[in-house]
Amino acid sequence: HKCDITLQEIIKTLNSLTEQKTLCTELTVTDIFAASKNTTEKETFCRAATVLRQFYSHHEKDTRCLGATAQQFHRHKQLIRFLKRLDRNLWGLAGLNSCPVKEANQSTLENFLERLKTIMREKYSKCSS
């Protein structure tokens, strides 16, 4: 069974996102992975997309993230582009209109993306074998 190109693109996006730190990757997001035992795969993707959308909507033009140098500004714009691409592809995989995100636990965006990358790589290894 051939892996969906969307899944491949998600992994590539996550690789790009986790390769470089920006001023914003240490900010916190809701940790949906902390207690996701009874959550379906589609719900996980939907909730991950919701968290990402909340993050970039809040921090897209956040002066703390924009930085003081042209390089920092460029990297932040790239981060936002990648988060939006990831959000869109996750919604596509989830196939759900909305999903609740009400966990109290927090993690850094960096750790959130690393965890998501692990999940996506596991999914890829299953569908490509």
């Epitope: 190109i5 491949q8 590539k12 460029h74 714009k77 936002i80 582009r81 691409r85 869109r88």
Partner: antibody, heavy 120, light 107 residues
């Protein structure tokens, strides 16, 4: 300043090939996905194809799939469109466009366009 | 493919008028919609992205709204340089698609 300049257009017979180029300057080309969009004379805009910043992912409109190939050379800051088996309906102005600074798959910088005419 | 239908197809208005152009998607696209302005013989120019975000350098008389399937572009007070053709574009999924365009003419 940020600029995209297309070249390679011209008149070509049906069934023949043409290669378009798009030279980028004024921005970090290797950090942006790129697109080709076309516009037939007197008609609306039609998205043609897209390539990731590092060339790893490519998408095509159904109308050109199997005939057109998008590629890029980041060392030369240049985007390409190889067009094979050209048809009369491929006649259009071809624009290269950069993905948006803040959002993917929108077009914030456009070239001036290059005209491709497919006619016998 | 997601189809975008713009209305009206053409529109006559005067300088100073408030103008609204609508774009309807054949299925939900969240806020993944952009608006462009194109003048004859020129490349399109990005006006609005993410349904309502104003592109840098674009006058504030342009605004966008909507989510899901219904979107609008509003020009609050038409200026002489605004007479052009306007296109909406969805980027929720591939293939990327455009509306058929709305031609804005001087009355």
């Amino acid at each position: 300043q940020v600029q995209l300049v297309e070249s390679g257009g011209g008149v070509v017979q049906p069934g023949r090939s043409l290669r378009l180029s798009c030279a980028a300057s004024g921005f970090t080309f290797s950090s942006y996905a790129m697109h080709w969009v076309r516009q037939a004379p007197g008609k609306g805009l039609e998205w043609v194809t897209f390539i990731w910043d590092d060339g790893s992912f490519k998408y095509y409109a159904e109308s050109v799939k199997g005939r057109f190939t998008i590629s890029r050379d980041n060392s030369k800051n240049t985007l390409y469109l190889q067009m094979n088996s050209l048809r009369a309906e491929d006649t259009a102005v071809y624009y290269c466009a950069r993905e948006g600074s803040w959002s993917p798959d929108i077009f914030d910088i456009w070239g001036q366009g290059t005209m491709v005419t497919v006619s016998s | 493919a997601i189809q975008l239908t713009q209305s009206p197809s053409s529109l006559s208005a005067s300088v100073g008028d408030r103008v609204t152009i609508t774009c309807r998607a054949s299925q939900g696209i969240s806020r993944a919609l952009a608006w462009y302005q194109q003048k004859p013989g020129k490349a399109p120019k990005l006006l609005i992205y993410d349904a309502s975000s104003l592109e840098s350098g674009v006058p504030s008389r342009f605004s966008g709204s909507g989510s899901g399937t219904d979107f609008t572009l509003t020009i609050s007070s038409l200026q002489p340089e605004d007479f052009a053709t306007y296109y909406c574009q969805q980027f929720n999924s591939y293939p990327i698609t455009f509306g058929q365009g709305t031609r804005l003419e001087i009355k």
